[in-house]
């Protein structure tokens, strides 16, 4: 068990703070909830503190919750590949470029670390080149979320990882908006981190609304499990 992994044996409170600017539309989001890495479970509620969110909530899911991949459930035989927990409590910087097909892009930078007993994800997001009447600024996405695989590989040069995946957003007309994600994680501290073999995270997300919440918001339930590395040969012959 890495030193950081010991911090995730129980339920951990989570705070998310985002400042965004998409095509000049500025906004802020705050979120709170908890994570339980034993089950790879996240429960979070987000509110837009600046009024109505100028982009669809589903376009921010990866920035919020795929931001705290330290809550992914890594099976026993894969724990030595869990970079995310090994970087804690000092945390990691997570940078992404998200290309929305035939539309604009988001660039995000986040610091994910413990502040006291709380896991905090502080994010800056800049979006450019979006069409005002496109799927994103035109709010044409359905309020739901598909399951995805998130592919992880070591980046030994930077003592971190590189992550690639493609998100499929459902559009109201029945078509799909693709969002290509290119992600890089580097540790904040100078302690040792686990550099993984290639593997993936399997994610399942459910979006809902709180009927009593007056502010523009999103309620998120997510389960994330690491996979893609088989037991070693010695395990097979036990």
């Amino acid at each position: 068990m890495s030193k950081g992994e010991e911090l995730f044996t129980g339920v951990v409170p989570i705070l998310v703070e985002l400042d965004g600017d998409v095509n000049g539309h500025k906004f802020s989001v705050s979120g709170e909830g908890e994570g339980d890495a034993t089950y790879g479970k996240l429960t979070l509620k987000f509110i837009c503190t600046t009024g109505k969110l100028p982009v669809p909530w589903p376009t921010l899911v990866t920035t919020f919750s795929y931001g705290v991949q330290c809550f992914s459930r890594y099976p026993d035989h894969m724990k030595q590949h869990d970079f995310f927990k090994s970087a804690m409590p000092e945390g990691y910087v997570q940078e992404r470029t998200i290309f929305f097909k035939d539309d604009g892009n988001y660039k995000t930078r986040a610091e994910v670390k413990f502040e006291g007993d709380t896991l905090v994800n502080r994010i800056e997001l800049k979006g450019i080149d979006f069409k005002e009447d496109g799927n994103i600024l035109g709010h044409k996405l359905e309020y739901n979320y598909n399951s995805h695989n998130v592919y992880i590989m070591a980046d030994k040069q930077k003592n971190g990882i590189k992550v690639n995946f493609k998100i499929r957003h459902n559009i109201e007309d029945g078509s799909v908006q693709l969002a290509d994600h290119y992600q890089q994680n580097t540790p904040i501290g100078d302690g040792p981190v686990l550099l993984p073999d290639n593997h993936y995270l399997s994610t399942q997300s459910a979006l809902s609304k709180d009927p009593n919440e007056k502010r523009d918001h999103m309620v998120l339930l997510e389960f994330v499990t690491a996979a893609g590395i088989t037991h070693g040969m010695d395990e097979l012959y036990k």
Partner: nanobody, 122 residues
Framework: QVQLVESGGGLVQAGGSLRVSCAAS????????MGWFRQAPGKERDFVAG????????YYADSVKGRFTISRDNAKNTMYLQMNSLKPEDTAVYFC?????????????????WGQGTQVTV
């Protein structure tokens, strides 16, 4: 554990003003977002106004926007609701509430700690 005690309620004429307070004891006050809710006889308990742990984010129900002002003094562990231009429909028991977390939500279910309430009659 947080204990909340409201004060300042009373009888006031329509168009008048009133300030209700909520004193908290227990853990670090700034760790909690706070809210005011009200309940008229035979009605649901409704969100009135809320304030984040730092005090930097506030939100009001449409029915009180521009008339009520929420504030907090973290040094004194106290939250206030200044109510101006009061109307008969503001008559209710006003409850102070706190949630474990600094983010301001408006849903009743997000609030874990509640005061006993103070009556405001217009």
């Amino acid at each position: 554990q947080v204990q909340l005690v409201e004060s300042g309620g009373g009888l006031v004429q329509a168009g008048g003003s009133l300030r209700v307070s909520c004193a908290a004891s227990g853990r670090t006050y700034s760790d909690y977002a706070m809210g005011w809710f009200r309940q008229a006889p035979g009605k649901e308990r409704d969100f009135v106004a809320g304030i984040s742990g730092s005090g930097g984010d506030t939100y009001y129900a449409d029915s009180v926007k521009g008339r009520f002002t929420i504030s907090r003094d973290n040094a004194k562990n106290t939250m206030y609701l200044q109510m101006n231009s009061l109307k008969p429909e503001d008559t209710a028991v006003y409850f102070c509430a706190a949630r474990t977390g600094t983010v301001l939500f408006t849903s009743r279910v997000d609030y874990r700690y509640w005061g006993q309430g103070t009556q405001v009659t217009v």
